[in-house]
Interface confidence: medium
């Protein structure tokens, strides 16, 4: 038979992967059974889905089950499912090439996980390469499969190469797949019924199909008495002194009780899904076990919610927040489908790849949704367009946000925000209808505390009596933000300033018109106003009048074409000056982000606009440099030294305000000239 089979080589990457699985999981061999059961369940899901729109799909075999049988004599373990089965072509492709197994990504993740010292056993399930874990315990794996569209075939491999042949026995399965493991000598424990039953119970708890193990049990049965035994009894009765009435004679037993070993299929799992049970009856440990089982994660979830939604659509759902963000959460954000939400209709698994079950920003949430109100006998494409899915999505988002809101403050700030803070910020940008709810979940660093993060609610609670705006300062780091000249006076006056240090932060705040009735004010832009008394207003106006010659000289002469206007600053206390963006110009931080993202490509209006966008130059009238400049300008407004000083101050302010200098060489030359002057060295001396 083997001579007639067609031989194949495994793809090189599959070989690499098998070695990796065997080397990294040799201490955790038992997971092979979890993977085989999981694959069987997937195959059953597929045929059940097909049967909804094809009435003949189950004709080959009406039952939907997984059956596991140990054969101690022959050293074999069989796992049989009545799932969709595989055609000859699929046996070759799915079990021998990279096409199906997601191998390259798996290899990368597996290597990363090993380097990070993380558990690798969950990864094989996540990447659909679990089948190969069979080689942890088997010298040889034989796959017999019957698909509705093909004859029955046998795939066989010793992990070095594989062969495929048409099954000479014909169709013995009806439909489905049997995986037969020829066990390694040291894996004979997996032929012990108790071992197998315990493992099956452990790994089949949340599989929604009946899983049976071929089991023996001792039963007491009544057997008819054999002839010699009957004769013996009659003899004993004849010796009896008392006569026995005829009717009593009828009652005499013609059978005996015998203990016998009976073999039958024993059901291993309670197939009522956990989400169908009332939440009051489900223990926390059960939720954790279910999460690990269905998500193929090794950690407990950070939070979960189990609910029944009623109204326009009725459905049951359990949603989970993982303890840590999946790797590559923002790789191809929005274009990569998330398969974390599994959709069931009337307990039938439909799909886990509907794009719109959750918005992109909640792409980390895992869970199940089971509805009786969606149609079963339609194509997935039709179902994806069903109007009730939008209602379900809306409720899932609300419930997810409820679940997140209920995470205890300490856990939220220390764990959730670190892992998923960016998702919440993207939610504020993307989800208009839930923006207010999401805004309450935002956390930022602020001047209130050197390390703790704050919510906007807490900020508003601490706002000063007449403060009507939420102040924020953006920078590439907290250090940069808190040492900015723009926050000097605010901090001195006891105002709290929020520090935005992530690239997405400023986008996020721009998407929030207000919070709790308070608008946001970027302190690096125009519009920062302080509540002032009549006396301080008079004092400010007098200062403005005093510095008018300097302000006009800067605008019209020294910094002509560089600034929009020069004004006396209300926000500076230490720094001599600062450069302030217009209301909707780029702040220094935004300019840095935009340039990093290479927005300025080609000759578009942004190049023209930002090249020509002049900023407001604010001066600190109390600073000795500024006071001295005023004196010098009054004396001689054509003084070359004071002209140079004005430009150096402008350029320094540009840098301190977070902007980039277009001409750093000229800046360096000017600084050198100023140094020469201060040290009385001839500016021309070589």
């Amino acid at each position: 038979l083997r001579e007639k089979s067609e031989k194949f080589a495994f793809q090189a990457e599959v070989n690499r992967m098998m070695k990796l699985i065997i080397n990294s999981l040799y201490k955790n061999k038992e997971i092979f059974l979890r993977e085989l059961i999981s694959n069987a369940s997937d195959a059953l899901d597929k045929i059940r889905l097909i049967s909804l729109t094809d009435e003949n799909a189950l004709a080959g075999n009406e039952e939907l089950t997984v059956k596991i049988k140990c054969d101690r004599e022959k050293n074999l373990l069989h796992v049989t499912d009545t799932g969709v089965g595989m055609t000859r072509e699929e046996l070759v492709k799915n079990l021998g090439t990279i096409a199906k197994s997601g191998t390259s990504e798996f290899l990368n993740k597996m290597t990363e996980a090993q380097e990070d010292g993380q558990s690798t056993s969950e990864l094989i399930g996540q990447f659909g390469v679990g089948f190969y874990s069979a080689f942890l315990v088997a010298d040889k794996v034989i796959v017999t499969s019957k698909h509705n569209n093909d004859t029955q075939h046998i795939w066989e491999s010793d992990s070095n190469e594989f062969s495929v042949i048409a099954d000479p026995r014909g169709n013995t399965l009806g439909r489905g797949t049997t995986i037969t493991l020829v066990l390694k000598e040291e894996a004979s424990d997996y032929l012990e019924l108790d071992t197998i039953k315990n493992l099956v119970r452990k790994y089949s708890q949340f599989i929604n199909f009946p899983i049976y193990v071929w089991s023996s049990k001792t039963e007491t049965v009544e057997e008819p008495l054999e002839e010699d035994e009957t004769a013996q009894e009659e003899k004993e009765e004849a010796d009896d002194e008392a006569a026995v009435e005829e009717e009593e004679e009828e009652k005499k037993p013609k059978t005996k009780k015998v203990e016998k070993t009976v073999w039958d299929w024993e059901l291993m799992n309670d197939i009522k899904p956990i989400w169908q049970r009332p939440s009051k009856e489900v223990e926390e440990d059960e939720y954790k076990a279910f999460y690990k089982s269905f998500s193929k994660e090794s950690d407990d979830p950070m939070a979960y919610i189990h609910f029944t939604a009623e109204g326009e659509v009725t459905f049951k759902s359990i949603l989970f927040v993982p303890t840590s963000a999946p790797r590559g959460l923002f790789d191809e954000y929005g274009s990569k489908k998330s398969d974390y939400i599994k959709l069931y209709v009337r307990r039938v698994f439909i799909t886990d790849d509907f794009h719109d079950m959750m918005p992109k920003y909640l792409n980390f949430v895992k869970g199940v949704v089971d509805s009786d109100d969606l149609p079963l006998n339609v194509s997935r494409e039709t179902l994806q367009q069903h109007k009730l899915l939008k209602v379900i999505r809306k409720k899932l988002v609300r419930k997810t946000l409820d679940m997140i809101k209920k995470i205890a403050d300490e856990k939220y700030n220390d764990t959730f925000w670190k892992e998923f803070g960016t998702n919440i910020k993207l939610g504020v940008i993307e989800d208009h209808s839930n923006r207010t709810r999401l805004a309450k979940l935002l956390r930022f660093q602020s001047s209130h505390h050197s390390t703790d993060i704050t919510s906007l609610d807490q900020y508003v609670e601490r706002m000063k009596e007449k403060q009507d705006k939420i102040y924020f300062m953006a920078g590439s780091s907290r250090k940069e933000a808190e040492s900015s000249p723009f926050v000097e006076r605010l901090l001195k006056k006891g105002y709290e300033v929020i520090y935005l240090t992530e690239p997405v932060d400023e986008y996020c705040i721009q998407a929030l018109p207000e919070f709790d009735g308070k608008r946001f004010q970027n302190v690096a832009k125009e519009g920062v106003k302080f509540d002032e008394s009549e006396k301080s207003k008079e004092s400010r106006e007098a200062t403005e009048k005093e510095f008018e010659p300097l302000l006009n000289w800067m605008k019209d002469k020294a910094l002509k074409d560089k600034i929009e206007k020069a004004v006396v600053s209300q926000r500076l206390t230490e720094s001599p000056c600062a450069l302030v963006a217009s209301q909707y110009g780029w702040s220094g931080n935004m300019e840095r982000i935009m340039k990093a993202q290479a927005y300025q490509t080609g000759k578009d209006i942004s190049t023209n606009y930002y090249a020509s966008q002049k900023k407001t130059f604010e001066i600190n009238p109390r600073h000795p440099l500024i006071r001295d400049m005023l004196r010098r300008v009054k004396e001689d407004e054509d003084d070359k030294t004071v002209m140079d000083l004005a430009v150096v101050l402008f350029e320094t302010a540009t840098l301190r305000s977070g902007y980039l200098l277009p001409d750093t060489k000229a800046y360096g030359d000017r600084i050198e000239r100023m140094l020469r002057l201060s040290l009385n060295i001839d500016p021309e001396a070589q």
């Epitope: 290479a598 927005y599 578009d604 966008q613």
Partner: antibody, heavy 121, light 110 residues
Framework: EVQLLESGGGLVQPGGSLRLSCAAS????????MSWVRQAPGKGLEWVSG????????YYADSVKGRFTISRDNSKNTLYLQMNSLRAEDTAVYYC??????????????WGQGTLVTVSS | QSVLTQPPSASGTPGQRVTISCTGS????????VSWYQQLPGTAPKLLIY???HRPSGVPDRFSGSKSGTSASLAISGLRSEDEADYYC???????????FGGGTKLTVL
């Protein structure tokens, strides 16, 4: 030279679907916020939807929310608009437009010539 | 009904100065930049003014924009026959999370 070329318009029945494409050239497509703007016959301009350069974050006008999906393929320099459950009031010329200054939410500096979508039984 | 309000029509004779107004609210014009677009008959719109008052290169300085509070206006001086077109104002609306246009003003050169 910056060019935006829309395609995919045509006649469709109410309730039907259509997918519009906009092929971009002459600039680094992946650096720009892109939008769809429509104009019903004899009427004014109506912004339909916008999409961020890389994150895939999307915005929609209330009139199309839940029915239209904007997407982009930066490797193909193409913007898409998947329109489902079409109504007669969606009949319009659909323009693809480039927005260089998002997130300061500035203007559309380049527009395509438009593609006509007619929804009628 | 457009979020930004423009007069439906305006007219002037060649050489004259014409102003078109655009009124909104604090969530759009009040706190965001205004743009103006010109649409000649049978063509796609063209950007005329951005960031309230800036002209893209190639737009004649006869066109100017200004903004005050929640209103913006477009002024065209030295009117020419080729200026006959529809003019639209536009701005981002932070409450609607959408870009909004005015209803358009048809300018006729008499």
């Amino acid at each position: 030279e910056v060019q935006l070329l829309e395609s995919g318009g045509g006649l469709v029945q109410p309730g039907g679907s259509l997918r519009l494409s906009c092929a971009a050239s002459g600039f680094t497509f992946s650096n720009y916020y892109m939008s769809w703007v429509r104009q019903a016959p004899g009427k004014g301009l109506e912004w339909v939807s916008g999409i961020y350069p890389n994150s895939g974050s999307t915005y929609y006008a209330d009139s199309v929310k839940g029915r239209f999906t904007i997407s982009r393929d930066n490797s193909k320099n193409t913007l898409y608009l998947q329109m489902n459950s079409l109504r007669a009031e969606d009949t319009a010329v659909y323009y693809c437009a480039r927005d260089p200054l998002h997130p300061a939410r500035f203007p559309f500096d380049y527009w395509g010539q438009g593609t006509l979508v007619t929804v009628s039984s | 009904q457009s979020v930004l309000t423009q007069p439906p029509s305006a007219s002037g004779t060649p050489g004259q100065r014409v102003t078109i107004s655009c009124t909104g609210s604090s969530s759009n014009i009040g706190n965001n930049a205004v743009s103006w677009y010109q649409q000649l008959p049978g063509t796609a719109p063209k950007l005329l003014i951005y960031a309230d008052s800036h002209r893209p290169s190639g737009v004649p300085d006869r066109f100017s924009g200004s903004k005050s509070g929640t209103s913006a206006s477009l002024a065209i001086s030295g009117l020419r026959s080729e200026d006959e077109a529809d003019y639209y104002c536009g701005a981002w609306d932070a409450s609607l999370n959408a870009y909004v246009f005015g209803g358009g003003t048809k300018l006729t050169v008499l």
